[in-house]
């Protein structure tokens, strides 16, 4: 029963992570710039995202412009776009794998196969979390590097936008949710399927596999 509870918690966290990731990728708030002129009338905030940039005037009026040419975009922006989309698709794939192996579904009958599917979905969600983390950390690194670069003009310096924080939250939720799904499935090791099934039926697995066992450090 505890295992089922962890599974549900895990999938809820990954779903929240996926939604966060989607919002993070879609919102044009990756980089934020504040231009303050001599007069408060010309004060404006520029939001830059993966797909468009927006200018918010002091009056509250907002104008957004979708980036024109894909080929004219900086390579890091193209890479961030690609990684964001791939991360979201990978997480969706993870959800489908999970649904196939969930305790409450009948797609797969054998308990050991279900356990493997849930474990696989957990791993897929962890991969999605890492993929989400890469563009977010890369962008944050660039913003921070610019901030401390004395030759970058003040007007060119950016601040961390809300999308980056959402991206970090998304990545954390996907990693945590994926990790929980991995933990709900006991490791078969060298033992046969009968042992695996017997151990799967117990509520508290003797050996759990946490997210820390996956080499996420290589990606950050």
């Amino acid at each position: 029963m505890a295992s089922a509870g962890m599974q549900i918690l895990g999938v809820v966290l990954t779903l929240l992570g996926w939604v966060n990731g989607l919002v993070s990728c879609a919102l044009p708030m990756w980089k934020v710039t504040a231009f303050i002129g001599n007069s408060i009338v010309v004060a404006q905030v520029v939001w830059e995202g993966l797909w468009m940039s927006c200018v918010v005037q002091s009056t509250g009026q907002m104008q957004c412009k979708v980036y024109d040419s894909l080929l004219a975009l900086p390579q890091d922006l193209q890479a961030a776009r690609a990684l964001c989309v791939i991360a979201l698709l990978v997480a969706l794939f993870g959800l489908l794998v999970y649904l196939a192996g969930a305790k409450c579904t009948t797609c797969v009958e054998e308990k050991d196969s279900k356990a493997r599917l849930v474990l696989t979905s957990g791993i897929v969600f962890v991969i999605s979390g890492v993929l989400t983390l890469i563009p977010v950390c890369w962008t944050a690194h660039a913003i921070i590097r610019d901030f401390y670069n004395p030759l970058v003009a003040e007007a060119q310096k950016r601040e961390l936008g809300a999308s980056l924080y959402l991206g970090w939250a998304a990545s954390g939720l996907l990693l945590l949710g994926g990790g929980l799904l991995c933990c709900t499935c006991p490791s078969g090791g060298s033992q046969g399927p009968s042992h695996y099934m017997a151990r799967y039926s117990t509520s508290a697995p003797a050996i759990s596999r946490g997210p820390s066992e996956y080499p996420t450090k290589n990606y950050v």
Epitope: P150, L151, A153, E154, Q156
Partner: antibody, heavy 119, light 107 residues
């Protein structure tokens, strides 16, 4: 009008010291990053040092680190470059440079002061 | 250190010609590149920053472009007053380095 006037250049023996000054006017001195860049007799440009607007952060290349020291007196609107353990390869025209709010890089250059290191 | 390889070292062209000076970085510098113009007997002046952005007051015949680690400064129609030495400079990381310069002359 932005005005940067360097002084203090001259002939110095290898191993000697020299202090360059840069008098700034026409802008709010304490709002800008300042730098020194030199131009060798072969016309090559070399970045020497940069200091933040408040003076709290300084940036040096390895070639001058430990030998050159940049400082600024925001009350006097003056930038300084203290050079010691001078070598023949330090012979160059030294330019005082102001950064800009809008533009990256070295935005405004002084007329330069010549430093010759020779025995 | 990042090396900036500038070419050609000297260039002679006629008034009205299209002139291109290139600068290649030894490693990735994103768009952290500036171009400077130094007229005879004068101090250098900033022309282009962030690889493509023109400083106010710089004639529109000047333009900057980037392709990976290769950067170009183009003068669409050479004018007599463009006779100068041109330098590229990266500001991606310390130490900031300049190209060796291109001396541009009129034929």
């Amino acid at each position: 009008e932005v005005k940067l006037v360097e002084s203090g250049g001259g002939l110095v023996q290898p191993g000697g010291s020299l202090r360059l000054s840069c008098a700034a006017s026409g802008f709010t001195f304490n709002s800008y990053t300042m730098s020194w860049v030199r131009q060798t007799p072969a016309k090559r440009l070399e970045w020497v040092v940069t200091i933040s607007s408040g003076g709290g952060r300084t940036y040096y290349p390895d070639s001058v680190k430990g030998r050159f020291t940049i400082s600024r007196d925001n009350a006097k609107n003056t930038l300084y470059l203290q050079m010691s353990s001078l070598r023949a390869e330090d012979t160059a025209v030294y330019y005082c440079i102001r950064g800009d709010y809008r533009y990256d890089g070295f935005a405004y250059w002084g007329q330069g002061t010549l430093v010759t290191v020779s025995s | 250190d990042i090396q900036m390889t500038q070419s050609p070292s000297s260039l002679s062209a006629s008034v009205g010609d299209r002139v291109t000076i290139t600068c290649r970085a030894s490693e990735n510098i994103d768009s952290y590149l500036a171009w400077y113009q130094q007229k005879p007997g004068k101090s250098p002046q900033l022309l282009v920053y962030a690889s493509t952005l023109l400083v106010d007051g710089v004639p529109s015949r000047f333009s900057g472009s980037r392709s990976g680690t290769q950067f170009s400064l183009t003068i669409s129609s050479l004018q007599p007053e463009d006779v100068a030495r041109y330098y590229c400079q990266h500001y991606y990381s310390i130490p900031y380095t300049f190209g060796s310069g291109t001396k541009l002359e009129i034929k």
